[in-house]
């Protein structure tokens, strides 16, 4: 074993950790459990204890990120560098970062939790054997009702353990149909659909009707994602395998490596590869989050790499199902922290152990009837990703820039962004900002340098808003957002971490919409945004002109001031006030003359 120079270590034994955000590859509960088990490996052999907390004051902050993610050590895309960790110390020291361009699993393929069946919700085991054939994804083979299922052990033929995979034929999520399954075919806008669709939506979410006619009944739900058969690469990344599919005239009901020299598994994403040529790679085994985390936490506790190939702290990933800690790892961590204290001796127990009840006999095959129980499901939308950058405390003093004509706010034609912060209006332009307080004879103060007050920010901002309860400031620029709490910044984070798709090029404004909720604007669209979860509800997407009739469609900034909404286009604003649930334009004016009270000379 090796330790960092000077035996860097924590000088207290009650270590805290914060899971700042999540990967979408695994259910949150699985991620939580993987980290808890990884810490437990180290606490089992030392006096250390690990307690999960929910603030960035934690000793070890755990973060998923991609590429440049807020430190000086960018990730490298899929494979290669899986994660990294910093040795013990304050701030970012001790933190562990995981590359979210990897496929995170428990080391044996994507984790697909099951429902119903006879496996008590256990995850699928990939690959599994059914009727002598190997399956690397859920299948409908052996069933007449089209429900995908999987074995939860390596061999269904011998073990008979199975469950149903997430499927729109079993249940839907959210929507307005109480989780009822899709009804195929269904009618939408006069057309017939026999599969989930994204038609009619701008956010890319797949949905279906839960009755035969959506146009008539307006009942729908969102289709569950199928991690086991969502392809990567090829020419259909993100789409689902279609089983069975035809390749060179032969039918395949599972992923195959036929036609490839490298042994990689692939599938078609339509029923006929020969005619459609649409395909992608099937998910691989992925990397065990538990094992990688256990290794990274070793670094975060003060262990360097080991030269013993069997050790957990050896610098190469190797999947194993045995006990991960090698004697070398134990020696290393005990060199830093000592052994776990022996528990107090306890008197022997005198109760006689009770015999365990015999196992209940399970059904012997995947059921061919639809489960009678009504499935209940919560949303599985993108997780509310936490911030991905270290805090950067910048100086709080505001420097006034030497004045030139362009530095007078009244000479600015179009501001980059405007926001009400505290009780003042802040106006941003090209790396500078002004403050304005309403009152007779008031003039904007400034300009001040954005870099002095918020040093992490770029010069050009698209929009800014303050969440009044938490006093958090959200700054948007292009496809990135920074969140300041006082002098601490989180970010930059990509907009997709807020649940905004790749088609959202920028956020052009925000309005308050109830306690802890905002409306985020981008061009002609808006979304409801939960400030605490830092996530938009993708199903809340709406057209601006439906909610705010009469405002221009090409506004470049939307902000709230004195409880009214302002939509800016060119040098002008359209002011909207809400009366009895109606949003009405009640004033159109110049930002400079009518808001900032600039003289009209």
């Amino acid at each position: 074993f090796q330790t960092f120079e000077g035996d860097l270590k924590w000088h207290h034994h009650n270590i805290t950790y914060w899971i700042q955000n999540y990967s979408e590859d695994l259910p949150r509960a699985v991620i939580d459990d993987a980290f808890a088990r990884a810490f437990a490996l180290w606490s089992a052999v030392t006096p250390l204890t690990f307690t999960r907390v929910y603030s960035r004051d934690a000793d070890i902050v755990i973060q998923f990120g991609v590429a440049e993610h807020g430190d000086g050590y960018p990730f490298d895309g899929k494979d290669g560098l899986l994660a990294h960790a910093f040795p013990p110390g304050p701030g970012i020291q001790g933190d562990a970062h995981f590359d979210d361009d990897e496929l995170w699993s428990l080391g044996k393929g994507v984790v697909v939790p099951t429902r119903f069946g006879n496996a008590d919700g256990a995850a699928c085991h990939f690959p599994f054997i059914f009727e002598g054939r190997s399956y690397s994804a859920c299948t409908t083979d052996g069933r007449s009702d089209g429900l995908p299922w999987c074995s939860t052990t390596a061999n269904y033929d011998t073990d008979d353990r199975f469950g149903f995979c997430p499927s729109e034929r079993l249940y839907t999520q959210d929507g307005n149909a109480d989780g009822k399954p899709c009804q195929f075919p269904f009618i939408f806008q006069g057309q017939s659909y026999s599969a989930c669709t994204t038609d009619g939506r701008s956010d890319g979410y797949r949905w279906c009707a839960t009755t035969a006619n959506y146009d008539r009944d307006k009942l729908f739900g969102f289709c569950p994602t199928r991690a086991d058969s969502t392809v990567m690469g090829g020419n259909s990344a993100g789409e689902l395998c279609v089983f069975p599919f035809t390749f060179l005239g032969k039918e395949y009901s599972t992923c195959t490596s036929e036609g490839r020299g490298d042994g990689r598994l692939w599938c078609a994403t339509t029923s006929n590869f020969d005619s459609d040529k649409k395909w992608g790679f099937c998910p691989d085994q992925g990397y065990s989050l538990f094992l990688v985390a256990a290794h990274e936490f070793g670094h975060a506790l003060g262990l360097d790499h080991s030269s013993v190939p069997e050790a957990l702290m050896y610098p190469m990933y190797r999947f194993t199902e045995g006990p991960p800690l090698h004697k070398d790892d134990v020696n290393g961590i005990r060199h830093l922290y000592g052994p776990r204290p022996e528990p107090e001796p306890r008197p022997p127990t005198t109760t006689t152990p009770q015999p365990t009840a015999p196992p209940t006999v399970c059904p012997t095959g995947p059921p061919t009837v639809h489960p009678s129980e009504r499935p209940t499901a919560g949303p599985t939308g993108p997780p509310s990703a936490g911030p991905t950058g270290p805090p950067t405390a910048g100086p709080s003093t505001a420097t006034t820039v030497p004045l030139s004509p362009v530095d007078d706010a009244c000479n600015v034609n179009i501001f980059d962004a405007i926001a009400e912060i505290g009780n003042q209006l802040y106006l941003f332009k090209d790396g500078k900002y002004w403050r304005f307080s309403e009152g007779r004879g008031s003039r904007p103060q400034g300009p001040f340098l954005i870099a002095d007050k918020w040093p992490a920010l770029p010069r050009k901002l698209d929009s800014v808003f303050e969440e009044r309860l938490s006093k958090k400031l959200f700054f948007f620029s292009g496809r990135q957002v920074w969140v300041y709490t006082g002098a601490s910044v989180l970010g930059p984070r990509r907009l997709d971490k807020l649940g905004l798709g790749a088609d959202v090029a920028q956020v052009t404004g925000a309005l308050r919409s109830g306690r802890g909720k905002m409306l985020l604007f981008s061009g002609r669209r808006l979304w409801r945004f939960d400030v605490k979860a830092q996530m938009v509800d993708p199903r809340s997407a709406s057209e601006v002109d439906r909610m705010f009739p009469g405002v221009p469609l090409d506004t470049h900034d939307v902000f709230q001031y004195r409880e009214k909404a302002y939509f800016c286009q060119d040098r002008f604003y359209w002011r909207v006030s809400s009366r009895s649930e109606l949003n009405q334009v009640d004033q159109v004016g110049y930002v400079t003359y009518d808001i900032l009270q600039c003289p009209e000379d």
Epitope: Y73, F75, G80, L82, P90, I92, H305, P315, T392
Partner: antibody
Framework: EVQLLESGGGLVQPGGSLRLSCAAS???????SMWWVRQAPGKGLEWVS?????????FYADSVKGRFTISRDNSKNTLYLQMNSLRAEDTAVYYC?????????????????WGQGTLVTVSS | DIQMTQSPATLSLSPGERATLSCRAS??????LAWYQQKPGQAPRLLIY???YRATGIPARFSGSGSGTDFTLTISSLEPEDYAVYYC?????????FGQGTRLEIK
């Protein structure tokens, strides 16, 4: 003893190309990220590019993006920098440098070994 | 990008005196700061990594301190061979950046 030896510099016309090499010895080359850093005459240090230990990622300064390509051959313990579309402002001594940090162990910041540098002059 | 500002640009001191060189980051970089010494015609040489750790073979008269945005390189008693240009470099955020250098010259 750790050694880094650059070669391949010289005089080239604007728009021309050069390929720099850096031969490494005395450490396990394949375990470390390697960098190119340059220094214009009489000026300070500027990072140019970095390549991760296995070659899994490369990064470039904005000033050279799209024109320079970093690569490595771990079997030959050699680092390369292919420089195309050279400009007068690329004139500098180019150093290769070894990162102190390696792999997923990112505790340390610093380049602990540097080559002696090779001069690239872009002039017509 | 994070700006690194070194001061003073030039420092004139006599042998045996104490030298204090400053480096300021435009935003917090934790302790991800290195100091280098460069003599004319030579490559830079790593003196201090992670703000306060002396690199292999560096004499004890060199010490580094600071974290966040303000960092200091101290040479407790100047030797003739210490006269050179000193650079700081950050890796608290991507991309890495260098300071413009402080020239330490004989008074």
């Amino acid at each position: 003893e750790v050694q880094l030896l650059e070669s391949g510099g010289g005089l080239v016309q604007p728009g021309g190309s050069l390929r720099l090499s850096c031969a490494a010895s005395g450490f396990t080359f394949s375990q470390y990220s390697m960098w190119w850093v340059r220094q214009a005459p009489g000026k300070g240090l500027e990072w140019v590019s970095v390549i991760y230990s296995s070659g899994s990622a490369t990064f470039y300064a904005d000033s050279v993006k799209g024109r320079f390509t970093i690569s490595r051959d771990n079997s030959k313990n050699t680092l390369y920098l292919q420089m195309n579309s050279l400009r007068a402002e690329d004139t500098a001594v180019y150093y290769c440098a070894k990162d102190r940090a390696y792999g997923d162990y990112v505790g340390w910041n610093g380049f602990d070994y540097w080559g002696q540098g090779t001069l690239v002059t872009v002039s017509s | 990008d994070i700006q690194m500002t070194q001061s003073p640009a030039t420092l004139s001191l006599s042998p045996g005196e104490r030298a204090t060189l400053s480096c300021r980051a435009s935003q917090s970089i934790s302790s991800f700061l290195a100091w280098y010494q460069q003599k004319p015609g030579q490559a830079p040489r790593l003196l201090i990594y992670d703000a306060s750790y002396r690199a292999t073979g560096i004499p004890a008269r060199f010490s580094g301190s600071g974290s966040g945005t303000d960092f200091t390189l101290t040479i407790s008693s100047l030797e003739p061979e210490d006269y050179a240009v000193y650079y700081c470099q950050q890796r608290g955020n991507w991309p890495i950046t260098f300071g413009q250098g402080t020239r330490l010259e004989i008074k």
